[in-house]
């Protein structure tokens, strides 16, 4: 058992069928000594006296505020979350795997530049009784300040028959270097408490390999004389990381009707503009990636070819 | 004061070329190593990620672009100091941040070289012979040493009696090519930022 | 099963003009670009010109420009060349291509030799 | 226009052993470079798109690098069936243009 915040206790089971379970003493937070009670929830049944209160902790039923009463008075509480473990394997049931980029992927997380700062983002399709709380470092074993803000619901969406909810957080590195190179990854530690369940899920990155660029901004056209082509210009997004010549990014430049089936034009350049042949009711698209570490590209940029 | 693209400064350009290269050959290298090696810890989530020039020589910091010098978090140490010749710098342009920025480069490179070197002549002696350092990686740093063109005391290859133990050669080869990517990609950047300044 | 399958070999006389067909067979043929480019003996690739059959665009080389057309009938799912005013050095294989990308490709017919000579 | 170079222009190989083309562009093109094989009395055969991509049905003994104006084609060890002639082209501008080709030879 141990301490996730005052007065909360994560009891680590190991959940099998018959399992002993695992022996909790709990003691009320008071100078009292005689007349104290004990109850479970809302329940009135006292389950027994004393300062102390032992307990076999197998189910989830045995989990919950326990209170210790003197006198129709509450002196204190103690939440009991249960974490399991099966087949030596911590439970995974509140988040959803994303699969990307590969199994048991739970979070998620981008930067938009070298700045430090990045968001993670985790699914769920529970709706209700459901908390988080995040911790972040670089390093583990001689941690360096990161800050996290609030876990909050950032997007709804129907999958099938089922509801799926988006939580995301954002996190700053306390002191961060747009151009150092990074020899300590990212350590990100995500609590979930859904009911009387606990689950803590992790990440761990370089801010390099997360680094999804903003779409480019601006997008052009200009049509060139007596020619099919077309000249389409951009700029830098605003967000990415400066000075440009240092922080450079490369672009993709794409003409595509309305179907990915559809044929198209494509070029790659380090420039900010290019030429491409367009068509009717297609779209000229453009993204961006960092020129000299290929994570990931931008969202794709849009302008149509009329 | 913007320079136009199409003509850069023809001191810097043979190094932004060779920059360029450089994490060409470096990446395809890891790439290579990660492939053949798949039963090794060789991915960057499975090494440890050490720097061999640390504490040597302080290239992140010389080559800061004069933007990000406001920034406390990137002014740790910027005492090294470093010879101030090379043929990547034209004259106008020679100032003591960009030679000391440069020599900092040369001597990463250096080390690295000597590294590699001394790695490579033990995955020979490998009965296996399942992975060798790739010969136009060498080159690279070669060339762009050359283009750097700086004066330094030659640092003797290491050699080892004892019988080397090829699993941790191996490793360390990998730890060794993670690291030099990202050394890398510092060079191409300074040498994209001095391109354009 | 995707092929482009060319017009015969040709022989003509200079001054005069070839039309070279390639049909397509396997796919929607108005899905992808279509190319010609042709070969002199023992000499590289040289690109002449591209059609897109959806809409009858077309883009040349500056080499070729004027003496050559490239037309496309999709009805029969034929693209065909025509260069006109042939010298001794139009003598090559002639080859279509197509992709659904605009700029490289990815199924080639067979050749069509075109020999110029009087 | 651009101009496609290509190094060497005959490379004599073992069977075996790997063997690496060059080809260069007079300006740079990103990665907008392409791979071909042709065989005498056939027509090419693409190998490699946009310089690294490989294609489906090319065997993985075919990679491609470069960026730029640099590129390389590396057969890491040389089939029977890869002696050949290779092209490079560029997509980068109009017109298309292609290397004079590499005639790969058995040594």
């Known amino acids: 058992i141990w301490e996730l915040k005052k007065d909360v206790y994560v009891v680590e089971l190991d959940w099998y069928p018959d399992a002993p379970g695992e022996m909790v003493v709990l003691t009320c937070d008071t100078p009292e000594e005689d007349g104290i009670t004990w109850t479970l929830d809302q329940s009135s049944e006292v389950l027994g006296s004393g300062k102390t209160l032992t307990i076999q902790v197998k189910e989830f039923g045995d989990a919950g505020q326990y209170t210790c009463h003197k006198g129709g008075e509450v002196l204190s509480h103690s939440l009991l979350l249960l974490h399991k473990k099966e087949d030596g394997i911590w439970s995974t049931d509140i988040l959803k795997d994303q699969k990307e980029p590969k199994n048991k992927t739970f979070l998620r997380c981008e930067a938009k530049n070298y700045s430090g700062r990045f968001t993670c983002w985790w699914l769920t399709t529970i709706s209700t009784d459901l908390t988080f709380s995040v911790k972040s470092s670089r390093g583990s074993s001689d941690p360096q300040g990161v800050t996290c803000g609030a876990a909050t619901l950032s997007a709804e969406r129907v999958r099938g028959d089922n509801k799926e909810y988006e939580y995301s957080v954002e996190c700053q590195e306390d002191s961060a270097c747009p151009a150092a190179e990074e020899s300590l990854p990212i350590e990100v530690m995500v609590d979930a408490v859904h009911k009387l369940k606990y689950e803590n899920y992790t990440s761990s990155f370089f801010i390099r390999d997360i680094i999804k660029p903003d779409p480019p901004k601006n997008l052009q056209l200009k049509p060139l004389k007596n020619s099919r082509q077309v000249e389409v210009s951009w700029e830098y997004p605003d967000t990415w990381s400066t000075p440009h010549s240092y922080f450079s990014l490369t672009f993709c430049v794409q003409v595509q009707g309305k179907s990915k089936r559809e044929k198209k034009d494509r070029v790659f350049t380090d420039k900010t503009s290019a030429t491409v042949i367009c068509r009717k009711n297609a779209s000229i698209s453009v993204r961006a990636q960092d020129r000299y570490y290929s994570s990931s590209w931008s969202e794709w940029a849009s302008v149509p070819c009329s | 004061r913007n320079l136009p693209v199409a003509t850069p400064d023809p001191g810097m350009f043979p190094c932004l070329h060779h920059s360029q290269n450089l994490l060409r050959a470096v990446s395809n290298m890891l790439q290579k190593a990660r492939q053949t090696l798949e039963f090794y810890p060789c991915t960057s989530e499975e090494i440890d990620h050490e720097d061999i020039t640390k504490d040597k020589t302080s290239t992140v910091e010389a080559c800061l672009p004069l933007e990000l010098t406001k920034n406390e978090s990137c002014l740790n140490s910027r005492e090294t100091s470093f010879i101030t010749n090379g043929s990547c710098l034209a004259s106008r342009k020679t100032s003591f941040m960009m030679a000391l920025c440069l020599s900092s480069i040369y001597e990463d490179l250096k080390m690295y070289q000597v590294e590699f070197k001394t790695m490579n002549a033990k995955l020979l002696m490998d009965p296996k012979r399942q992975i060798f350092l790739d010969q136009n990686m060498l080159a690279v740093i070669d060339e762009l040493m050359q283009a750097l063109n700086f004066n330094s005391e030659t640092v003797p290859q290491k050699s080892s009696l004892e019988e080397p133990d090829f699993y941790k050669t191996k490793i360390k080869l990998c730890i060794l090519l993670h690291a030099f990517r990202i050394r890398a990609v510092t060079i191409d950047r300074v040498m994209s930022y001095l391109n354009a300044s | 099963q995707v092929q482009l399958v060319q017009s015969g070999a040709e022989v003509k006389k200079p001054g005069s003009s070839v039309k070279v067909s390639c049909k397509a067979s396997?796919?929607?043929?108005?899905?992808?670009?279509l190319h010609w480019s042709r070969q002199a003996p023992g000499q590289g690739l040289e690109w002449m010109g591209w059609?897109?059959?959806?809409?009858?665009?077309?883009e040349y080389a500056p080499k070729f420009q004027g003496r050559v057309t490239i037309t496309a009938d999709e009805s029969t799912s034929t693209a065909y060349m025509e260069l006109s005013s042939l010298r001794s050095e139009d003598t090559a294989v002639y080859y279509c291509?197509?992709?659904?990308?605009?700029?490289?490709?990815?199924?080639w017919g067979q050749g069509t030799l075109v020999t110029v000579s009087s | 226009d651009i101009v496609m170079t290509q190094s060497p222009l005959s490379l004599p190989v073992t069977p075996g052993e790997p063997a690496s083309i060059s080809c260069r562009a007079s300006?740079?093109?990103?990665?907008?470079l392409h791979w071909y094989q042709q065989k005498p009395g056939q027509a090419p055969r693409q190998l490699i798109a946009?310089?690294?991509q490989s294609i489906s049905g090319v065997p993985s003994r075919f990679s491609g690098s470069g960026s730029g104006t640099d590129f390389t084609l590396t057969i890491s060890s040389l089939q029977p069936e890869d002696f050949a002639t290779y092209y490079c082209?560029?997509?980068?501008?109009?017109?298309?243009?292609f290397g004079q080709g590499t005639k790969v030879e058995i040594k």
């Open positions: 082209q560029q997509s980068n501008s109009f017109p298309l243009t």
């Open positions: 291509a197509r992709n659904k990308e605009l700029r490289y490709f990815d199924v």
């Open positions: 300006q740079s093109i990103s990665i907008n």
């Open positions: 396997g796919g929607t043929f108005s899905d992808y670009y």
């Open positions: 946009f310089a690294s």
């Open positions: 059609i897109d059959p959806e809409n009858g665009d077309t």
